[in-house]
């Protein structure tokens, strides 16, 4: 005890009353109002507790402190008086703070600040929404992936910041009267081919596809080495000539010179040169067959191989070249009798007749074109009388049943063997190279030299054998009728044709004379 009679043992946050008692300081309380033992403590009174008599008033919060309390304006409010703290409702001057005015960038981009009592909210602009993890941040709404499908199916949706566009897909354009961008955009396919917006090489033909286009090799052309067909960057080369080279194993200067000419014509060939090129090839062939030179010294079999090779190649080359001709009828004839008749048309539904000096061909136009082939329809007939020299003594191979029929009703082949070629050799071709089984037959009328009485006349075609040579055959060809100097043949395929006179001893009254082979 001190000399003034004040207890020295008073607990923290208390003051002595006298030498034996203490009292808690204001803002603190103990179990009993007067403290008489040092074991008692003074605890802070929470003036802000619910049952407390302290009232700070509206828009404010009570903050308890050690031994006291403070009233402060709630977040979003501030005191008009400027005093940061106060003690009771009567001192409360708290009013709402307009955060939006205080900080115009509060809602960052794409949002509008809206003041609320004690706070603010961000209202997002159209095309934006509040980010869940940051409700004050507006982020772009991706209308394209939100499942709203705001665009027409002919367009594709492009998300923009705060918006979206419905744009025509590549290779499409707005239909007449439609915008390109708004959600009411409707598009249609652009035909790049007819509008000239394509970049196809001159060696190709442009094909429109939905939303795009492709470049396909012209008929008779092939993709350049290593470049695929049917692409936008396809470049092609003419293949009409590349495969028509001398047959292997045949050594003939005359033939080599012919093929040199063919290769020369092919080297700088262009589609516009088709007419001149056809004429030049036939001119060269006519000259070759008029003066075969050392070809005539070759063994017969080799001559047949050369003829086979010439007929086969000529057909391919003429088919390829004629696809580049303009519509119309062409007739060319050459000094040694070679003759070409050609008709080129956009497909028409009628029959076509090609007339030549020694042959007439009649067939249905719709055979000419392969379905899906964009080029013109071509029907061609070449008469090659000079080919007869190379085909002398060429064998005739009959189907077993025809062979049997002839042997039963005739005396059989006479000893001198090989049939005689009565007519010019003709070659028929179409733009469609699939001519092995025509849906309607082709009719040929041949003019030829006189038939020796009691000899069998046969309509034949040249069958290219596996060995690169060939023989005369009758499969698919029938003799419709024959007079002394003309014969009508009907065939279900195209190739090179002729009329042969076979050395059968036919009995004059023999009814088999009228049998169609």
């Amino acid at each position: 005890q001190d000399s003034r009679g004040c207890a020295r043992w008073c607990p923290q946050d208390s003051s002595c009353v006298n030498a034996t008692a203490c009292r808690c300081n204001p803002g603190f309380s103990s179990f009993s109002e007067i403290i008489t033992t040092p074991m008692e403590t003074c605890d802070d009174i929470n003036e802000c507790a619910t049952l407390s008599k302290v009232s700070c008033g509206k828009f404010s919060d009570c903050w308890n402190t050690e031994g006291s309390y403070d009233c402060v304006c709630s977040p979003g409010y501030e005191p008009v008086s400027g005093a940061k703290t106060f003690k009771n409702e009567s001192e409360n001057t708290c009013q709402d703070v307009d955060e939006c005015q205080q900080n115009p960038r509060l809602c960052k981009s794409y949002g509008t600040c809206v003041n609320t009592l004690g706070s603010y909210t961000c209202q997002c602009l159209p095309g934006f929404k509040l980010k869940p993890e940051d409700p004050k941040l507006c982020t772009d709404v991706n209308e394209c992936t939100s499942g709203q499908n705001p665009c027409h199916s002919s367009t594709h949706c492009l998300n923009n910041v705060g918006s979206y566009q419905c744009r025509c897909r590549p290779g499409w354009q707005p239909i007449p009267g439609s915008p390109n961008g708004p959600n009411n955009t409707v598009c249609e396919d652009v035909d790049e081919c007819s509008s000239g917006q394509h970049q196809c090489d001159s060696s190709t033909v442009c094909f429109n596809t939905v939303g795009s286009y492709s470049c396909r090799c012209r008929p008779g052309w092939k993709p350049r080495h290593g470049i695929p067909n049917n692409q936008k960057d396809t470049v092609c080369e003419d293949m009409t000539f590349s495969t028509w080279t001398p047959p292997p194993g045949v050594h003939s200067q005359t033939l080599s010179r012919f093929f040199d000419k063919v290769q020369d014509l092919g080297r700088d060939y262009k589609p516009g040169l088709a007419n001149n090129t056809i004429q030049s090839i036939l001119q060269a062939l006519d000259e070759l067959l008029e003066a075969p030179g050392d070809l005539e010294t070759l063994p017969r079999l080799q001559q047949h191989c050369v003829a086979s090779h010439l007929l086969d190649g000529l057909e391919d080359v003429l088919r390829g070249l004629s696809k580049n001709l303009s519509n119309g009828l062409l007739n060319f004839s050459y000094p040694a009798g070679t003759e070409l008749s050609l008709e080129v048309q956009k497909q028409v539904d009628r029959s076509v007749t090609l007339r030549q000096n020694q042959a007439v061909m009649q067939l249905d136009w719709n055979q000419a074109q392969k379905s899906g082939d964009p080029g013109p329809s071509v029907v061609g007939l070449v008469s090659i009388p000079g080919m007869g020299k190379l085909l002398a003594e060429a064998p005739l191979v009959l189907e077993p049943e025809k062979q049997m029929l002839l042997h039963e009703t005739h005396q059989g082949l006479l000893q001198d063997g090989s049939p005689i070629l009565l007519s010019d050799v003709i070659s028929a071709f179409l733009s469609n190279n699939d001519t092995q089984n025509l849906s309607s037959p082709v009719t040929f009328t041949f003019s030829h030299r006189s038939v020796i009485p009691r000899q069998k006349v046969l309509c034949v075609f040249w069958e290219h054998g596996q060995n690169g040579c060939g023989h005369w055959a009758t499969t698919g060809c029938s003799t419709i009728g024959t007079r002394d100097t003309s014969t009508i043949c009907r065939c279900t395929h195209l190739s090179s044709f002729a009329v042969l006179m076979a050395h059968y001893d036919v009995q004059e009254e023999d009814p088999v004379l009228t049998v169609i082979t």
């Epitope: 001159s202 010179r257 040199d260 000419k261 290769q263 020369d264 014509l265 080297r267 700088d268 262009k270 589609p271 516009g272 040169l273 007419n275 001149n276 090129t277 030049s280 001119q283 060269a284």
Partner: antibody, heavy 118, light 106 residues
């Protein structure tokens, strides 16, 4: 009838360029190559190159590669030849001619005289 | 390139005479053409494809040959035939002309 009409005579300084024209008529312009040939005074014929009007494809002799440019305008059926970096030895008569491998050059223009002199 | 050598370079002849000139190629040629040129005029195609006479060319002119050797012949010289004759090939690029044979009056 087939005609090839060439532009008039030109006088140029060394280093300059000249562009000659050859207007075709009487045939389908795209069905033949257009050849360009020159002939220096007292000399023989020298091929420069050829252009195919159908697709603009060109062929040049090595000597003129990069210095001569052959073009064709199908809308006017006119072929052009431009020769750059002219030298005095380019003084010659320049001819255009219609050509095809098997037929040779069957029609010729009347020729354009180009004189290169300082 | 294929070099065409014409011989002779100059040929003197009299009207009525038979004249032959040749064109030799450094490699085989399949299409050979011949042109006639008179002073101050453009050349004219005279013979094409070795032996075919161009339109309007008299039949006293003829051509022959194959491979590397070609010949141009005038069976009976006429006064209007005096000119320079050129051979030409386009069997391979570049197209080439021979140096010409000048046919002059003896």
């Amino acid at each position: 009838q087939v005609q090839l009409q060439q532009s008039g005579a030109e006088v140029k300084k060394p280093g300059a360029s000249v562009k000659l024209s050859c207007k075709a008529s009487g045939y389908t312009f795209t069905n033949y190559w257009m050849q360009w040939i020159r002939q220096a005074p007292g000399q023989g014929l020298e091929w420069i190159g050829a252009v195919y009007p159908g697709d603009g494809d060109t062929r040049y002799t090595q000597k003129f590669q990069g210095r001569a440019t052959l073009t064709a305008d199908t809308s006017t059926s006119t072929a052009y030849m431009e020769v750059s970096s002219l030298r005095s030895e380019d003084t010659a008569v320049y001819y255009c001619a219609r050509g095809f491998t098997a037929y040779g050059m069957d029609y010729w223009g009347q020729g354009t005289t180009v004189t290169v002199s300082s | 390139e294929i070099v065409l050598t014409q011989s002779p370079a100059t040929l003197s002849a009299s009207p009525g005479e038979r004249v032959t000139m040749s064109c030799s190629a450094s490699s085989s040629v399949s299409y050979m053409h011949w042109y006639q040129q008179k002073p101050g005029l453009a050349p004219r195609r005279w013979i094409y494809d070795t032996s075919k006479l161009a339109s309007g060319v008299p039949d006293r002119f003829s051509g022959s040959g194959s491979g590397t050797d070609y010949t141009f012949t005038i069976s009976r010289m006429e006064p209007e035939d005096f000119a320079t004759y050129y051979c030409q090939q386009w069997s391979s690029n570049p197209l080439t002309f021979g140096g010409g044979t000048k046919l002059e009056i003896k």
